[in-house]
């Protein structure tokens, strides 16, 4: 493949409040002492604040030349590499009802490509060969997605669609709206 890469910069993905479902209505009662306002927690946060910064899904920007055999792109292309940790749902904003945080182990999230973009590149070849046009598939954004037993490692569930299984004897929670499906696979020259 022979890609040359030069690291440019990094962007940290910090999920917005709007990415997560609203607190389920059955938790908003006297028993919880309005804990729903605090993400299901008492007013003070029962986890070390350093934990939040421990987890971040970063978009590292790389500039690369696309090669195809002896041919190389006239200009470098910039794409993202997803890196970093995705924390437990409980540590993320407004995550109440999304998981059973009191368990010692829970859903595993990974920072992986979310969207891709197609870019047409012109490859210059040695020996007076005519330039070739190629369409390459590049990572456009990263996202925390859940590893799930119903999928292969490569097929991951959107973080925003994960919903806790209803507890025994309780009304099932409405599942969050499904995120937009990834763009169709684009032709990958490399």
């Amino acid at each position: 493949q022979g890609w040359q890469a030069f690291k440019n910069d990094a962007t940290e993905i910090i999920p917005e409040l709007g990415e997560y479902p609203e607190p389920p209505p059955e938790l908003e009662n006297n028993k919880t002492m309005n804990r729903a306002e605090n993400g299901g927690r008492p007013p003070h946060h029962p986890f070390e604040t350093k934990d939040v910064s421990e987890y971040s899904c970063r978009e590292l920007h790389f500039t690369r030349y696309v090669t195809d055999g002896p041919c190389r792109s006239a200009k470098p292309v910039t794409e993202l590499v997803c890196s970093g940790q995705c924390g437990p749902a409980r540590l993320l904003p407004n995550a109440i009802g999304r998981g059973k945080w009191w368990r010692p182990s829970g859903p595993d999230f990974r920072c992986i490509p979310d969207r891709y973009r197609a870019q047409r590149v012109q490859l210059l070849c040695p020996g007076g060969e005519a330039p070739r046009a190629r369409k390459v598939r590049l990572v456009a954004s990263c996202k925390c997605k859940r590893l799930t037993r119903f999928h292969n490692q490569s097929e991951l569930k959107d973080f925003g669609t994960e919903a806790a299984r209803p507890q025994k004897g309780r009304k099932p929670r409405p599942r969050a709206r499904s995120a937009k499906a990834n763009q169709a696979e684009l032709e990958n020259a490399y």
Epitope: T32, P42, F47, P88, K100, W101, S105, G106, R146, R149
Partner: antibody, heavy 119, light 110 residues
Framework: EVQLVESGGGLVQPGRSLRLSCAAS????????LHWVRQAPGKGLEWVSG????????DYADSVKGRFTISRDNAKNSLYLQMNSLRVEDTALYYC????????????WGQGTTVTVSS | QSVLTQPPSASGTPGQRVTISCSGS????????VNWYQQLPGTAPKLLIY???QRPSGVPDRFSGSKSGTSASLAISGLQSEDEADYYC???????????FGGGTKLTVL
């Protein structure tokens, strides 16, 4: 100093009941989810039950479901395990453990209390 | 028999690097985070690694965790005599609806 101290263990006959207690100190009790983990003599660890800060945040291992009941009293900084219909295979060292980091493992442990079920 | 499979024993000499494996299935390690515990002889277990590869404060960086597919591993570099202990992996199992432990690995420092 963060501390969990178990008590209530002892020798009991099969079919009888026992209540274990775990007293917590050195941390804000309400902040922690609490669990019971047991270890039979010469064997590995076995998770028994866990509780968040509300009664609807409870889990049990299949081996104790319907026989054991976990509860907590935040006012008394205490965790309990009511064990009914005890069996010989329930003989073990019972640890009280806690976690306050979501899905972050059991980061606080007591020293354990021994339960022996024998006729 | 434990839901998570660990080798019953492992050994190494001081300064060496030792790896302990933990094999599970899609319903536990395959979809949930893995924790590792150390139990020194005659003492209560201690959390060593959480969320697959995170170390609680106070745990030396000689200890590291990793996970791939339905398996996890604990690596101990620069082995020391005080590392002689039983090591357990653990993860939530969605099928059993329980927190499951591996059978434990007894590490001997030769």
């Amino acid at each position: 100093e963060v501390q969990l101290v178990e008590s209530g263990g002892g020798l009991v006959q099969p079919g009888r009941s026992l209540r274990l207690s775990c007293a917590a100190s050195g941390f804000t009790f309400e902040d922690y989810a609490l669990h019971w983990v047991r270890q039979a003599p010469g064997k590995g660890l076995e998770w028994v039950s866990g509780i968040g800060w509300d009664d609807d945040m409870i889990d049990y291992a299949d081996s104790v479901k319907g026989r054991f009941t976990i509860s907590r009293d935040n006012a008394k900084n205490s965790l309990y395990l009511q064990m009914n219909s005890l069996r010989v295979e329930d003989t073990a060292l019972y640890y009280c453990a806690g976690n306050n980091r979501g899905y972050g493992g059991l980061d606080v442990w007591g020293q354990g209390t021994t339960v022996t079920v024998s006729s | 028999q434990s839901v998570l499979t660990q080798p019953p024993s492992a050994s190494g000499t001081p300064g060496q690097r030792v790896t302990i494996s933990c094999s599970g299935s899609s319903s536990n390690i395959g979809s949930n985070t893995v924790n590792w515990y150390q139990q020194l002889p005659g003492t209560a277990p201690k959390l060593l690694i959480y969320n697959n590869n995170q170390r609680p404060s106070g745990v030396p960086d000689r200890f590291s965790g990793s996970k791939s597919g339905t398996s996890a591993s604990l690596a101990i570099s620069g082995l020391q005599s005080e590392d002689e202990a039983d090591y357990y992996c653990a993860a939530w199992d969605d099928s059993l609806d329980s927190y499951v432990f591996g059978g434990g690995t007894k590490l001997t420092v030769l």
